[in-house]
Each structure stands twice: as C-alpha cells, then as structure tokens.
C-alpha cells in the first residue's frame, strides 16, 4: 500500500487590510473580551485559503481574543474579511446596592470596534445586580419595536434581551429601533445582546444606544413601558413566547394613551391554551386613572374581546405552574385612534 499525499501551496499576497495595523484600545474598559473568529460556514471539500488575524503582526491565528485593560495592535492576513466576524462580551456588575442605585451606564459599541474591517456579529452586555436588592431599567435612545411574526424587525440590528441567571430560561424578546417601547424594566440579571444582521449596521450605528440604570428592586420579572404612535399598530408578545412564559412568572405592560386618543386592545387567540398544575394564570387589565380592574382567569376563560381604553392602562399577566406542553404565550396589539367624542 502506497500512501499518496496531494497538497497545494498557496502564496497569499497581503490584501490592503493586511498592510494596515488597527489599534483596539481597551485600556479604559473593564470586564470585556473581544473575539475575532471565522463565521460558521457549511463545510465543503473545496480548498479555502487561510484567513488569519495577527496580534502585533507576530502571532497569527484563525481566532483571536482581546481582553480589556490594554491597547492591542492587530492586523489581518485574509483574502476575504467577510469570512470573519466579531463577538464582544462585557460585564457590568453591581456588588454594593447602596453605591449602584440610580447609577447609569451607556450600552454602546465603542467606536474603536466599529472601525475594524470585520463585521460585528454580537455585542453582549451582561448586567448583574445583587439578588433581591436592585433591578434594572433599559432606556433606548430611540423607542423600540418588539420583533414578532406579524411585524418583524427590518433594521440592520436588534437587541436580544434574556435572563442571565443560569437556572432561568427566560428570553424577553428581540427589539429593534423604531417602535413604541419606551423602556424595559427587568427584575434581575440579564444579558442584552446587540446583534447585527447586515453590513449596513455601520451606517445605522448612530441609531444604537441603550442606557441601563440600577433601580430599586421589584418583584415582577419584567415591565414594558409602551407609548404607542398614532400611525401604527403595536404588537406585543409575552416573553419566551416559543417555549411559554416561565412558571409563576409575572410581566406587565404600562400602556400610555394620549388625551385625544382611544386605544384598542386586541388579543390574537380566543383561549390562552395554558393548563395549570399549581395555581392559576391570571390577566389583569387596570385603568390607571380610576384603578378599575378586569381580571381574567387565563386557564379557565376565553380571552377578552377587543376593548377600548380612553386612559392609560396596565396589562399584567401572572402565570401559574403549567403542565408540560400547555404553556402560556399571548400576542396582543394596541392601536390608537382619534377620540371622536370627548369622554373625559
């Protein structure tokens, strides 16, 4: 048996980007790591030229992780930089609740990173708070839209908000600029991931911008503050909609209704479909001005028919402990229309 080896030697001419040295200044950053790596591709048997990222022009590899606390000089040896992407992780944590309360941080991709010739895939902020002491509020520079099948996001990036507690499988949703969500309050540790979907993110980068603040602790898993536009229908969905709202979780929407408008609240199912093992699933719709509330037992009754609200109102959903396979997920919409009669 003769062993035959067939190989090819490829001499790569440095591309324009390879001649450049890029400075990534992470010296003022804390608890941050930046990874440049090959983006996943379908395996093919065809030979693909190497694609390397070099640190200080000396150490070259297909993957490179840069950590905070210093300045890094990097260069590329690659025929096609679209084969690489960047993933960044940054942790913002609070250990002393007295020091952190009301403190704010800007969740923005540093310009150094945006200027690199490699596409940013994910920039994740892990936001950690002392348990049962503080909660978090996310305030976007531009109001957000929740991505739903009925109204998908069509921007070049989205914010993916999920719980960062290992035991908790809770995904609040995907949000993009250009909607009606003014702020998102969350009870405990979360990760906020800015995910890009198109190279045009570079041009749209100015639309990104979230501020996170540490606020006094509250018991609900999440509170969405919604200020609908008169022009469009707002679609809102319960967190974890594909897997169902976690057991015994409560979420609320604070929906503002301008003085000259009427809000129509519509649910997209007749029944919630949840079957409870322990407790019951309830939805409470409460008028903020009069405090009058309507209570619906989601596991026993049909969902309400479209209702009209002349004043700001709350929608609160509290889950039971459901039987497997019969989970709670609700989609509803809010539409504003001008008031025809003054109903003060």
């Amino acid at each position: 048996g003769i062993l035959r080896l067939q190989f090819q030697v490829l001499v790569q001419h440095p591309q324009n980007e390879s001649n450049k040295i890029y400075v990534v200044d992470l010296s003022n950053e804390r608890a941050m790591s930046l990874t440049i790596e090959p983006r996943p591709v379908k395996q093919s048997r065809k030979f693909v030229p190497g694609c390397f990222v070099c640190l200080e022009s000396r150490t070259c590899s297909s993957n490179l992780t840069l950590t905070s606390g210093s300045k890094h000089k990097i260069s590329f040896l690659c025929d096609d930089l679209t084969r690489l992407w960047m993933n960044v992780e940054k942790t913002i944590s609070c250990t002393d609740h007295r020091y952190c309360q009301r403190k704010s941080y800007s969740l923005q991709v540093p310009s150094d990173i945006l200027h690199l010739p490699v596409e940013l895939h994910d920039f994740s902020w892990k936001l950690l708070v002392p348990k049962d002491r503080l909660s978090l509020v996310l305030v976007p520079a531009q109001k957000l839209q929740q991505h739903t099948h009925e109204k998908p996001c069509n921007t070049s990036f989205s914010y993916l908000v999920a719980s960062a507690i290992p035991s908790q499988d809770l995904y609040f949703g995907s949000f993009c600029p250009g909607g009606s969500i003014k702020q998102i309050q969350v009870k405990q540790n979360i990760s906020v991931t800015l995910r890009t979907f198109a190279p045009s993110f570079q041009q749209e980068a100015s639309r990104q911008g979230l501020t996170v603040s540490f606020i006094p602790y509250f018991k609900e898993e999440g509170v969405f503050t919604v200020t609908p536009d008169t022009k469009s229908k707002v679609y809102l969905r319960t967190p974890n909609w594909d897997r169902g709202l976690p057991s015994l979780t409560s979420v609320s929407w604070n929906i503002s209704v301008p003085r000259d408008q009427v809000a129509c609240l519509t649910f997209f199912k007749e029944r919630s479909g949840v079957v409870c093992q322990t407790g019951r699933a309830f939805m409470i719709i409460q008028e903020q001005r009069t405090r009058a509330e309507e209570i619906f037992s989601l596991d026993e009754d049909v969902l309400p028919k479209p209702s009209f609200h002349h004043h700001s109102f709350w929608v609160n959903i509290s889950n039971c402990s459901p039987t497997s396979g019969k989970q709670l997920d609700l989609l509803f919409s809010v539409t504003l229309t001008p008031r025809t009669v003054d109903l003060t």
Epitope: L248, T278, G279, R280, A281, F282, A292, E293, E294, I295, F296, S297, E300, D301, V302, S318, C320, S321
Partner: antibody, heavy 126, light 107 residues
C-alpha cells in the same frame, strides 16, 4: 358594601326543578369565580358547584353532577343554580359565595370564599 | 376526590383556653387549605386561607399552620364570641370539599 343576596328557594316535590339566583353588588362581579355551597339541616357544609369569572369553566360535586347547572350573567351581576331532578337529600340552605383571588408565595390562585350570602332554603318533600 | 377529616368533632372549653383543631387531608394539598367559622343561623366566615394567612379583620388570636396532609387551627385564648362551629376546606382545585366540622362549646 360588598353583598350577595340569594333568592328562589322554596318547597318543591321530588323530581321537580328550582332555579336559585344570587344578586351581587359592591364589587366587579365578572372578575371573580363564584360558588354554591349548601348545608342540610343540622349538618355540615357541602360544596356544590363553582363557575369561573368569565363563565368559561364550571365545576360540580359528584352528588349533583348531571342534575344541577351553574351559570352567570355578568351584565346583570347575577349567579344562577338550575336544579333539576330534585331529591329529598337536596334539602338544605343554599349559599352563594365569592372566591378571593390572592397571591401567596408567588402563586396566584383562588384562596377561599371571602364573601357569603345569607342563604336561601330549599325543601324537597312530597 | 380529596377527603378532609377534622378532629375532634366536639370540643368543650372555657373562656381563655387555648384551643387546637386538626384537619387531615386524604392526599397532599400543599398549603391549599382554608378555615371558616360559622355561628348558628349565619353564613360561614373566612378566617384563614393558604393554611396560615389570616384574612383581613380576623383577630390575631386565630392562627393556622401545617402543609401537605396535616393542618391545625389554633385559638390562643378563647373568647365568648368564638363559640361556634369551625370547618376546614381544601382549595386544591375543584371539586372542593369541607371537613365535617368541629363544634366548640362552652364548658
């Protein structure tokens, strides 16, 4: 003031029918599940039936299943109990009672009957 | 269906006495239990829900404890207005059932 007022009781022959009503006031009736509970002379309390706030779910004790029907008219703030094929053992004072909805240790549920009517007497006798 | 057994069925006590009534469930009901007080010719009154939570307006001499299958209602110092019949009721889904009752009489 939160109040429940039963009516419709009376004397009926075995095999006969009767319809009890319970008029509610002082609270948002449609928000709460409602119950019928009875008490035979000199005996203890017996839960009879319940209905969810929206009327979408109904529940019955085995002793009345198939004979009694609970219903509600939220526009009239009224709870009903239609009793058919009455037997001597159905003789009792019938109370309507409101379920309380409370959250206890993170679990929201019905946690007992916090408001009761004064009761209406049903006598089944020939 | 879940059966509830109360003990004792009758209890004679004096004003100032500490009184304990027991309620046993035929299967585990977590803390899904309520206690009611009923006086002759009157409708029952909710005293305690979720096994140990005192209903608003109920005097603090009443207390409840237990979980699973064994529950107790305690009156720390019996008052003249406490002579009545007491019922436990399970709240763990429908059908709901009551215990047979415990009559507290004056000794």
């Amino acid at each position: 003031e939160v109040q429940l007022l039963e009516s419709g009781g009376g004397l009926v022959q075995p095999g006969g029918s009767l319809r009890l009503s319970c008029a509610a006031s002082g609270f948002t009736f449609s928000n709460y599940a409602m119950n019928w509970v009875r008490q035979a002379p000199g005996k203890g309390l017996e839960w009879v039936s319940a209905i969810s706030g929206g009327g979408g779910s109904t529940y019955y004790a085995d002793s009345v299943k198939g004979r009694f029907t609970i219903s509600r008219d939220n526009s009239k703030n009224t709870l009903y109990l239609q009793m058919n094929s009455l037997r001597a053992e159905d003789t009792a004072v019938y109370y309507c009672a409101k379920e309380s909805i409370t959250m206890v240790r993170g679990v929201m549920d019905y946690y007992g009957m916090d408001v009761w009517g004064q009761g209406t007497t049903v006598t089944v006798s020939s | 269906d879940i059966q509830l057994t109360q003990s004792p069925s009758f209890l004679s006590a004096s004003v100032g006495d500490r009184v304990t009534i027991t309620c046993r469930a035929s299967q585990g009901i977590s803390s899904y239990l309520a206690w009611y007080q009923q006086k002759p010719g009157k409708a029952p009154k909710l005293l305690i829900y979720a096994a140990s939570t005192l209903q608003g307006g109920v005097p603090s001499r009443f207390s409840g404890s237990g979980s699973g299958t064994e529950f107790t209602l305690t009156i720390s110092s019996l008052q003249p207005e406490d002579f009545a019949t007491y019922y436990c009721q399970h709240l763990n889904r429908f059908p709901r059932t009551f215990g047979q009752g415990t009559k507290v009489e004056i000794k």
